[in-house]
Interface confidence: medium
């Protein structure tokens, strides 16, 4: 299974739902397809309520049975953990793979949780974040944001990921707009506590 | 070369047994689910089931579960399609292919020449 | 059991341009930019011609490209030669696996 970068607000934009949610056990093979279903327990939702419509919730995360079929692995024993979960939605049903944006809540940055709460949806549908993975790479339009964290960090996960959101500056130009946290957590020269 | 080579055309009774073969080179065939797809005389494609022969974890779809059996050998990296009991409406052209995997997409790749099964009393 | 529904044939004359259609619903083709056109000429084995919508492997003709509109996917094969003469399928992702395929369309070469 091969998934491509993903910036949390590309993720958010194509996603159906976005929750916040605990996962409850072991997956449950359903037989006849090529699926199988955690429990899930939602505490948040964040996108996808015009979606929903009348549902109050999702009790099940599908996914592919096996992590060669991108499905997801959920390797969390604790039960009690929240997750961010960016998923899709298919007849009435959450659904989501290896390629998910799939995360503890509290490994998000408090950037990315307040973007992922109120932010990135300002840019869903007019702005576009774009990956740079080689140099060189230029802006193909002025409603995109050159993406450069794989460039300059070596890793999807650097200034533009976890500080950053692409936004209009106006209607015709979109930039990459701080999210108003200390940036002191992803700087390349600091060391994480031990 | 990249390729997945079928055995021959076979032509047996109702009732008797067959198994047809696909073999891979020129890729890791431990790394790629193996599918099988049945094209009846005239008719569409449909997917019978795939295999991942690096563990010989196998899915059927639902119309083909328990009508045949799908099964691989990693050591000549080689596919299997068997009958146990023939029947005249298993007649078709048989396909094996190589299914890619990202995300939410699975789509074939390559493909084996075909295996035409005639079964006829 | 079919999910895709394509016409089940398509003309053009040599040099036109053609397009053939894939129509499913928001949870196969329209909820995902993950559709697959297939070639299969009278007595061979298919052959990819375009994957992820509108992707093509490589050795195949710049002639043949894919599009996707809400619920429709398209396949436009343009500067139509004798040699495109064949069925077409579209594929997409399902949960059924049964369901993947569309039935097909005969594009003729007129």
């Known amino acids: 299974c091969s998934c491509a970068p993903t910036h949390p607000q590309t993720a958010f934009c194509n996603s159906d739902l976005v929750i916040r949610a605990k996962f409850m056990g072991s997956p449950e093979i359903i037989e006849t397809t090529l699926y199988q279903r955690y429990e899930i327990k939602m505490t948040k939702m964040l996108k996808g309520f015009d979606a929903v419509g009348n549902a109050t919730g999702f009790r099940f995360a599908y996914t592919p049975a096996m992590e060669s079929l991108c499905g997801y692995v959920h390797k969390s024993q604790n039960r009690s953990e929240e997750f961010l979960i960016a998923g899709r939605l298919r007849n009435g049903n959450l659904h989501i793979t290896a390629c998910s944006f799939l995360v503890p809540w509290h490994n998000l940055s408090p950037a990315q949780q307040k973007a992922f709460v109120k932010t990135y949806s300002a840019g869903c549908g007019v702005c576009t974040v774009f990956p740079c993975s080689a140099i060189p790479c230029k802006l193909e339009s002025d409603s995109h944001c050159l993406w450069t964290d794989q460039i300059l960090m070596g890793s999807e996960k650097g200034y533009q990921s976890d500080h950053f959101a692409c936004l209009p500056r106006n209607p015709d130009l979109c930039t990459w707009q701080y999210l108003g946290v200390s940036m002191t957590r992803s700087l390349p020269l600091a060391k994480a506590e031990a | 070369q990249v390729q997945l080579v079928q055995s021959g055309a076979e032509v047996k009774k109702p009732g008797e047994s067959l198994k047809i073969s696909c073999k891979g080179s020129g890729y890791s065939f431990t790394s790629y689910w193996i599918g099988w797809v049945r094209q009846m005389p005239g008719k569409g494609l449909e997917w019978m089931g795939i295999?991942?022969?690096?563990?010989?974890?196998?899915r059927y779809s639902p119309s083909f579960q328990g009508q045949v059996t799908i099964s691989a050998d990693k050591s000549i990296s080689t596919a299997y399609l068997q009958w146990s009991s023939l029947k005249a409406s298993d007649t078709a052209m048989y396909y094996c292919?190589?299914?890619?995997?990202?995300?939410?997409?699975?789509?074939?790749?390559?493909w084996g020449q075909g295996t035409l099964v005639t079964v006829s009393s | 059991d079919i999910a895709l529904t394509q016409p089940a044939s398509v003309s053009g004359s040599p040099g036109q341009s053609i397009t053939i259609s894939c129509t499913g619903t928001s949870s196969d083709v329209g909820g995902y930019n993950y559709v697959s056109w297939y070639q299969q000429h009278p007595g061979k084995a298919p052959k990819l011609m375009i994957y992820?919508?509108?992707n093509r492997p490589s050795g195949v003709s710049n002639r043949f490209s894919g599009s996707k509109s809400g619920n429709t996917a398209s396949l436009t094969i343009s500067g139509l030669q004798a040699e495109d003469e064949a069925d077409y399928y579209c594929?997409?992702?399902?949960?059924?696996?049964?369901?993947?395929f569309g039935g097909g369309t005969k594009l003729t070469v007129l």
């Open positions: 292919a190589r299914l890619r995997v990202h995300d939410y997409a699975m789509y074939f790749d390559l």
């Open positions: 992820d919508v509108s």
């Open positions: 594929q997409s992702y399902d949960i059924m696996p049964e369901r993947v």
């Open positions: 295999i991942y022969p690096g563990d010989s974890d196998t």
